[in-house]
C-alpha cells in the first residue's frame, strides 16, 4: 500500500460509524474532476474503511483519491483530518 493509500485508510478508520456512512453519501455527489467516474452506490454503501480505500485508489489513483477524500472530509466539517491526510500524502 502506497503512502497516500495508507493516509486515506488512516483517515477513514478515524471516522465514527455515522461519519463513515455520511462520507459515503457525500462521495456519491461530490463534484469530480472531468474524466473520472463515480463509484457505484450499491457497492459503496456496504464497504468498510479498508474496502473503501481500495476502491478510492482503484477508481481515482492515489493522488487524486487522497485529494477527493480530503475534500469530502472538508465537506463534513473535518478540516483538520483533511489537512493531516494531505500533509501525510505530500511528505
Amino acid at each position: 500500500m502506497g503512502r497516500a493509500a495508507a493516509a486515506i485508510l488512516d483517515a477513514l478508520e478515524n471516522l465514527t460509524a455515522e461519519e463513515l456512512k455520511k462520507f459515503k453519501l457525500k462521495l456519491l455527489s461530490v463534484p469530480l474532476r472531468e474524466g473520472y467516474g463515480r463509484i457505484p452506490r450499491g457497492a459503496l454503501l456496504s464497504m468498510d474503511a479498508l474496502d473503501l480505500t481500495d476502491k478510492l485508489v482503484s477508481f481515482y489513483l492515489e493522488t487524486y483519491g487522497a485529494e477527493l477524500t480530503a475534500n469530502v472530509l472538508r465537506d463534513m466539517g473535518l478540516q483538520e483530518m483533511a489537512g493531516q491526510l494531505q500533509a501525510a500524502t505530500h511528505q
Partner: antibody, heavy 114, light 107 residues
Framework: QVQLQQPGTELVKPGASVKLSCRAS?????????????LEWIGNINLSNGRTNYN??FRAMATLTVDKSSSTAYTQLSSLTSEDSAVYYC?????????????WGQGTSVTVSS | NIVMTQYPKSMSLSIGERVTLRCKAS??????VSWYQQKPEQSPKLLIY???NRYTGVPDRFTGSGSATDFILTITSVQAEDLADYHC?????????FGAGTKLELK
C-alpha cells in the same frame, strides 16, 4: 426555511460570564461581529456527536456545548471585557458540499458594561 | 491562519451598474470560498458557496468565480436592494476566516 432561534440581547458586567443558546442542527458555528466590523469565527460544534473546533483566539474564553435532547447549541463566554461587546450569531452548515454557513440566527447582542 | 483580503473596502455606484468585488486568500483554498450579503441590522445571508455555486433563491445577477487564491463576486446589474456589506469566507481550513467586507453604497 430553517429558523435558528437565538435570544435578542444580554447585558453583562465586566469579568462575568454569559451563556448563549441556539436551537439548531448538524454543525453549528458561532460568529462574533463587533459594531461596524467584520465577522470572526469563534468555533463550531457537531450536534450529533459533540465534535468541536475552536479558533485559538477564543479558546480561553469560549466553551461550546450541546444539549441533544433539545437540539440546542450553547456557547459560554467567560471573563468578559468591553472588547467582547458584539453581536454573536449562530449559523448552520447544511449544504452538502463546501461547508458554507447557509442558515444564520438573528444574533444575540451582548453588551459588557458596569 | 488563512487571511482573506477583500477589496475595495467600499464602492459608490449607481443602480444598474456592473460590480466586481474581489477576495484574495493568503494560501490555496481550492474552491472552499463563500460569499455572504449583510444588510444593516440583519444577519448575513449566503449568496455563493464553493466559489461559484449560487445558493437557493439567490438572483442570477450574482455570480461567483475563481479558485485557489483569487475570487470574484460579480453583480451584473446592481439593484437598490443589493446595497449592503459583502463578506467572503473560507472553509478550507480551521479556523474558518472571513474578509473584512466590502460596503456597497449609492452614489
Amino acid at each position: 426555511q430553517v429558523q435558528l432561534q437565538q435570544p435578542g440581547t444580554e447585558l453583562v458586567k465586566p469579568g462575568a460570564s454569559v451563556k448563549l443558546s441556539c436551537r439548531a442542527s448538524g454543525w453549528t458555528h458561532w460568529v462574533k461581529q463587533r459594531p461596524g466590523q467584520g465577522l470572526e469565527w469563534i468555533g463550531n460544534i457537531n450536534l450529533s456527536n459533540g465534535r468541536t473546533n475552536y479558533n485559538e483566539k477564543f479558546r480561553a474564553m469560549a466553551t461550546l456545548t450541546v444539549d441533544k435532547s433539545s437540539s440546542t447549541a450553547y456557547t459560554q463566554l467567560s471573563s468578559l471585557t468591553s472588547e467582547d461587546s458584539a453581536v454573536y450569531y449562530c449559523a448552520n452548515s447544511m449544504v452538502p458540499h463546501f461547508f458554507p454557513m447557509d442558515y444564520w440566527g438573528q444574533g444575540t447582542s451582548v453588551t459588557v458594561s458596569s | 491562519n488563512i487571511v482573506m483580503t477583500q477589496y475595495p473596502k467600499s464602492m459608490s455606484l449607481s443602480i444598474g451598474e456592473r460590480v466586481t468585488l474581489r477576495c484574495k486568500a493568503s494560501e490555496n483554498v481550492g474552491s472552499y470560498v463563500s460569499w455572504y450579503q449583510q444588510k444593516p441590522e440583519q444577519s448575513p445571508k449566503l449568496l455563493i458557496y464553493g466559489a461559484s455555486n449560487r445558493y437557493t433563491g439567490v438572483p442570477d445577477r450574482f455570480t461567483g468565480s475563481g479558485s485557489a487564491t483569487d475570487f470574484i463576486l460579480t453583480i451584473t446589474s446592481v439593484q437598490a436592494e443589493d446595497l449592503a456589506d459583502y463578506h467572503c469566507g473560507q472553509s478550507y481550513n480551521y479556523p474558518l476566516t472571513f474578509g473584512a467586507g466590502t460596503k456597497l453604497e449609492l452614489k
